[in-house]
């Protein structure tokens, strides 16, 4: 906490400029008007303030806006955002995607911090759902964002937003998350033709039930082993040897390399040896 001291004569700041970097902390506190700072926040990032000086500027804004900063200030926080705590951010009402982008840019290249997580949470809750533009933005900055959401949070994602999801965005999703996302993807892509549909739905198939896998096996999709390995065990077990052969097409030979791994191992165990022998891969049930 900076002590309240009178501003020395001639030092009162008329605008936010580089001369302020020579001010001591107490001088910044005494000589910079909080309202001036708020209106000229966009200039702060162009000035090489020390961390200590930024602390003073934050303190001034906190005094001016005890109930939380207005969006006009938030949008121009820049590196001052890194000084904010999750508690500070919970007081904000961020509605503009441009504001969100500006703040995410500050944290770019770093892992998602508690501050960023809180900011995103506030933004998404404010919007009521995770719309396509928001999802586009968030996954661009954090490819793993979608998989950081709980199944309950994912349930608010409208099917239309699924078009924004790239395969790499689902890399770290667990089965419970894919269980929620798969029906949305199925709905989003339902009007596509066979081969195009499979390309789009492939990344989501970790949430697919047996019936859908059986249907896909009738469409010559040639599923690769990497996708097959991500399928739900309970969805794979009821598939017949013939259905798996059709589903994988030329990739069926890859089962041999995965015979000790789930879900392939579980599936093999539950097949008749005579049926497995038809594959000619030497799989032992």
């Amino acid at each position: 906490e900076v002590e309240k001291t009178a501003c020395p004569s001639g030092k009162k700041a008329r605008e936010i400029d580089e001369s302020l970097i020579f001010y001591k902390k107490w001088e910044l506190e005494a000589c910079v008007d909080a309202a001036l700072l708020a209106t000229q926040m966009d200039r702060v990032n162009a000035i090489p303030f020390t961390y200590e000086q930024l602390d003073v500027l934050k303190h001034k804004l906190d005094e001016l806006y005890p109930q939380g900063y207005p969006e006009s200030v938030i949008q121009h926080l820049g590196y001052l955002f890194l000084k904010m705590s999750p508690e500070d951010i919970r007081k904000w009402n961020v509605t503009s995607l441009e504001t969100l982008k500006a703040l995410l840019e500050v944290n770019k290249g770093h892992e998602m911090s508690p501050q960023v997580a809180t900011l995103i949470d506030r933004f998404v809750k404010g919007r009521g759902q995770l719309d396509k533009d928001t999802l586009d933005t968030l996954t661009a900055f954090y490819p793993g964002y979608l998989c950081s959401l709980s199944p309950e949070e994912l349930s608010s994602v409208p099917p239309s937003s699924i078009w924004a999801v790239r395969p790499q965005d689902l890399d770290t999703c667990d089965p419970r998350q894919l269980d929620v996302l798969y029906p949305k993807a199925r709905l989003a892509f339902q009007n596509m033709n066979g081969s195009e549909y499979f390309v789009k739905i492939q990344s989501f198939l970790g949430g697919a039930p047996t019936e859908d896998l059986k249907a896909l096996s009738q469409q010559n999709v040639s599923m690769d082993l990497a996708t097959f390995m991500k399928l739900r065990t309970d969805a794979v077990l009821p598939l017949t040897v013939a259905e798996v052969q059709k589903l994988l097409g030329p990739h069926v030979e890859g089962l041999k390399a995965e015979e000790r791994h789930r879900p392939v191992r579980d599936w093999i165990l539950r097949q008749r040896q005579d049926d497995l022998d038809t594959l000619g891969l030497g799989l032992q049930g």
Epitope: D174, P175, D234, H261, R262, L269
Partner: antibody, heavy 119, light 107 residues
Framework: QVQLQESGPGLVKPSETLSLTCTVS??????????WSWIRQPPGKGLEWIGY???????NYNPSLKSRVTISVDTSKNQFSLKLSSVTAADTAVYYC???????????WGQGTMVTVSS | DIQMTQSPSSLSASVGDRVTITCRAS??????LNWYQQKPGKAPKLLIY???SLQSGVPSRFSGSGSGTDFTLTISSLQPEDFATYYC?????????FGGGTKVEIK
């Protein structure tokens, strides 16, 4: 609900064969989703999986124990058994039988039986 | 074989504390990771399966996360009955392996 109970001698001499049986009650050893495992825990140490059997008779063993282990199943008695040959003091442990549900994990365990290898 | 490395091997905590235990696989195991709790003289009990799914009857203060090689078990608010040893286990590869265990003791 399904319960498991281990039985067998608590003392085995070095170089002999350890034999244990697990009796399944309240359910069938022929369950589609279940495999039946043996897991052991030496005193004061961690858990070591020994192997499993499916009701069809298919088995899978821990590679480090494979040469000494045989697991069998008797569907008529609703039991499965473990034989571990050429035992040494290093095989002294609490031996557990457990059900593994293919969709979850080792969800049901016996209470364990202490087997000491000593002359 | 896939090696499972748990850390820490032991920890001291107080009732009400948030406790985090990590488990690392020597190669990717997708989401095939289970967590067990074992109390002295008792058989282990399944807490979490498939990395993040809560086994029926297990309190919601237990949660799991992770995929690939890095996994976490979290107890949001430690209760007196939670002082025990926790093991991770991979059922992905046929040579099922357990982590070395993490003993959670009273501070």
């Amino acid at each position: 609900q399904v319960q498991l109970q281990e039985s067998g001698p608590g003392l085995v001499k070095p170089s002999e064969t350890l034999s244990l049986t697990c009796t399944v009650s309240g359910g069938s050893v022929s369950s589609y989703y279940s495999t039946w495992s043996w897991i052991r825990q030496p005193p004061g140490k961690g858990l070591e999986w020994i192997g499993y059997i499916y009701y069809s008779g298919s088995t899978n063993y821990n590679p480090s124990l494979k040469s000494r282990v045989t697991i069998s199943v008797d569907t008529s008695k609703n039991q499965f058994s473990l034989k571990l040959s050429s035992v040494t003091a290093a095989d002294t442990a609490v031996y557990y039988c457990a059900r593994e549900d293919a969709l979850t994990g080792f969800d049901i365990w016996g209470q364990g039986t202490m087997v000491t290898v000593s002359s | 074989d896939i090696q499972m490395t748990q850390s820490p091997s032991s920890l001291s905590a107080s009732v009400g504390d948030r406790v985090t235990i990590t488990c690392r696989a020597s190669q990717s195991i997708s989401s095939y990771l289970n967590w067990y709790q074992q109390k002295p003289g008792k058989a282990p009990k399944l807490l979490i399966y498939a990395a993040s799914s809560l086994q029926s009857g297990v309190p919601s203060r237990f949660s799991g996360s992770g995929s690939g090689t890095d996994f976490t078990l979290t107890i949001s608010s430690l209760q007196p009955e939670d002082f025990a040893t926790y093991y991770c286990q991979q059922p992905y590869d046929a040579s099922y392996t357990f982590g070395g265990g993490t003993k959670v003791e009273i501070k």
